[in-house]
């Protein structure tokens, strides 16, 4: 969490941002809140990106003002116009690109004063893994697949029964470049699995950590997966 305060001139206002990560090709949110004003027409929101000379987005007098928007953000940004009055200056970024990563500044002017806060935005690709029993294999084998990751993640297997065991000798992980030539499909195979055990396939890079669990018993197979972003720090 980054909390920024205004400078000189008018009074300062508190602006708060939260570091976040964007998934390439999907929509992302750059979070920013500020002390609200009672009049929408008095609020100016400017989003800027370090090293980019045009604006990322500008909202003033109750509407978007994009004449000075940088070409790299053309048609990809929006604020939540109906929430600006309550102090939400968050930016929706459509079709996140790898090059969107960097330091952003949320700069606010209201009748109460000015303020700004920076936000670190990481970009990459992350997806939920799915673990299945590979019935085509000669021995009991589990296959963990996740369709989109970038940068290349690490894959670690764990089991509930053999806690602390190192499965690197009995697993094989491959990374296959997807058609857009950036993200990769992750496939990891674990051999010699035993029934009545829960196995976890953990995929992690510097942006996200995802786990796919599978519980194999004689009568059923239970699956569960979850994904966690690693860098949500507020400012």
């Amino acid at each position: 969490l980054i909390i920024g305060f205004g400078i000189s001139g008018r009074h300062s206002i508190t602006v708060t941002t939260v570091a976040s990560a964007g998934n390439i090709g999907e929509d992302g949110i750059l979070s920013c809140t500020f002390e609200p004003d009672i009049k929408l027409s008095d609020i100016v929101i400017q989003w800027l990106k370090e090293g980019v000379l045009g604006l990322v987005h500008e909202f003033k007098e109750g509407k978007d003002e994009l004449s000075e928007q940088d070409e790299m953000f053309r048609g990809r940004t929006a604020v939540f116009a109906d929430q600006v009055i309550v102090g939400n200056a968050s930016l929706r970024l459509k079709n996140v690109q790898l090059t969107d990563a960097g330091t952003y500044k949320c700069y606010i002017i209201t009748s109460k004063g000015k303020g700004n806060a920076n936000l670190e935005y990481k970009t990459g690709a992350f997806s939920m893994p799915e673990v299945n029993v590979d019935y085509n294999a000669s021995s009991e084998t589990l296959r963990c697949e996740a369709p989109r990751w970038f940068p290349q993640p690490t894959v670690v297997w764990a089991s509930q029964v053999d806690q602390g065991a190192n499965f690197s000798e009995v697993s094989n992980t491959s990374f296959e470049l997807n058609s857009e030539n950036v993200t990769m499909k992750v496939v990891s195979v674990l051999y010699n699995v035993t029934i009545n055990n829960t196995y976890s396939c953990m995929i992690e890079n510097d942006i996200a950590k995802a786990t796919g669990d599978i519980k194999v018993t004689e009568s059923e197979i239970k699956r569960r997966s979850h994904l966690q972003l690693l860098n949500s720090k507020a400012s």
Epitope: G51, L53, G54, L66, S67, Q69, E71, R74, G75
Partner: antibody, heavy 116, light 107 residues
Framework: QVQLVQSGAEVKKPGASVKVSCKAS????????MYWVRQAPGQGLEWMGR????????VYAQKLQGRVTMTRDTSTSTVYMELSSLRSEDTAVYYC?????????WGQGTLVTVSS | DIQMTQSPSSLSASVGDRVTITCQAS??????INWYQQKPGKAPKLLIY???RLQSGVPSRFSGSGSGTDFTLTISSLQPEDFATYYC?????????FGQGTKLEIK
């Protein structure tokens, strides 16, 4: 006031290279992109590319890719445009222009003549 | 690349006339269009930016309108110093292409 002053006219032989300079004054040099536009005799305006004076990052017109190089020197607030493997059709007035989404002001122009 | 089709390519008019030059973009460019005036031997000069905004110091007889793909530059009452070549330019997507120009001549 904001001013862009370009280097003088050049005469070059086909196959040679030319380097045109554009010195900026009257504003924060790193605050806006610098663009290059050329105009062949009696013809219209052709966008050549741009440079970000902060980072040095460039975007070039596809037809000039591989022949054009834009650089900058922040210590002297100067940008450079170098065009290599010159041919007769590169004979033109070359302009630098400052901006984000519109160009203002423009340099006075540099005439580059390519002739054997 | 986005194509900018400007018309007419040349135009004869008299002092005091109202003159309209049009520019059509090959795709939607919102209001990312600029208009420049160029006189012989001189660099182009910005007249209108963001489709309709008058650049500081430019006389109010110049105006711009339009959004999407169709745009217009209007000179409400031609003055002798207005005889020049006019260019539109899109700044929606690189390369920031120009129209082919409209030469405004004295009738």
């Amino acid at each position: 006031q904001v001013q862009l002053v370009q280097s003088g006219a050049e005469v070059k032989k086909p196959g040679a290279s030319v380097k045109v300079s554009c010195k900026a004054s009257g504003y924060t040099f790193t605050a806006q992109y610098m663009y290059w536009v050329r105009q062949a005799p009696g013809q219209g305006l052709e966008w050549m590319g741009r440079i970000n004076p902060t980072s040095g990052n460039t975007v070039y017109a596809q037809k000039l890719q591989g022949r054009v190089t834009m650089t900058r020197d922040t210590s002297t607030s100067t940008v450079y445009m170098e065009l290599s493997s010159l041919r007769s059709e590169d004979t033109a007035v070359y302009y630098c222009a400052r901006g984000i989404n519109w160009f203002d002001p423009w340099g006075q122009g540099t005439l580059v003549t390519v002739s054997s | 690349d986005i194509q900018m089709t400007q018309s007419p390519s040349s135009l004869s008019a008299s002092v005091g006339d109202r003159v309209t030059i049009t520019c059509q973009a090959s795709q939607d460019i919102s209001n990312y269009i600029n208009w420049y005036q160029q006189k012989p031997g001189k660099a182009p000069k910005l007249l209108i930016y963001a489709a309709s905004r008058l650049q500081s110091g430019v006389p109010s007889r110049f105006s711009g309108s339009g959004s999407g793909t169709d745009f217009t530059l209007t000179i409400s009452s031609l003055q002798p110093e207005d005889f020049a070549t006019y260019y539109c330019q899109q700044s929606y997507r690189s390369p920031f292409t120009f129209g082919q120009g409209t030469k405004l001549e004295i009738k």
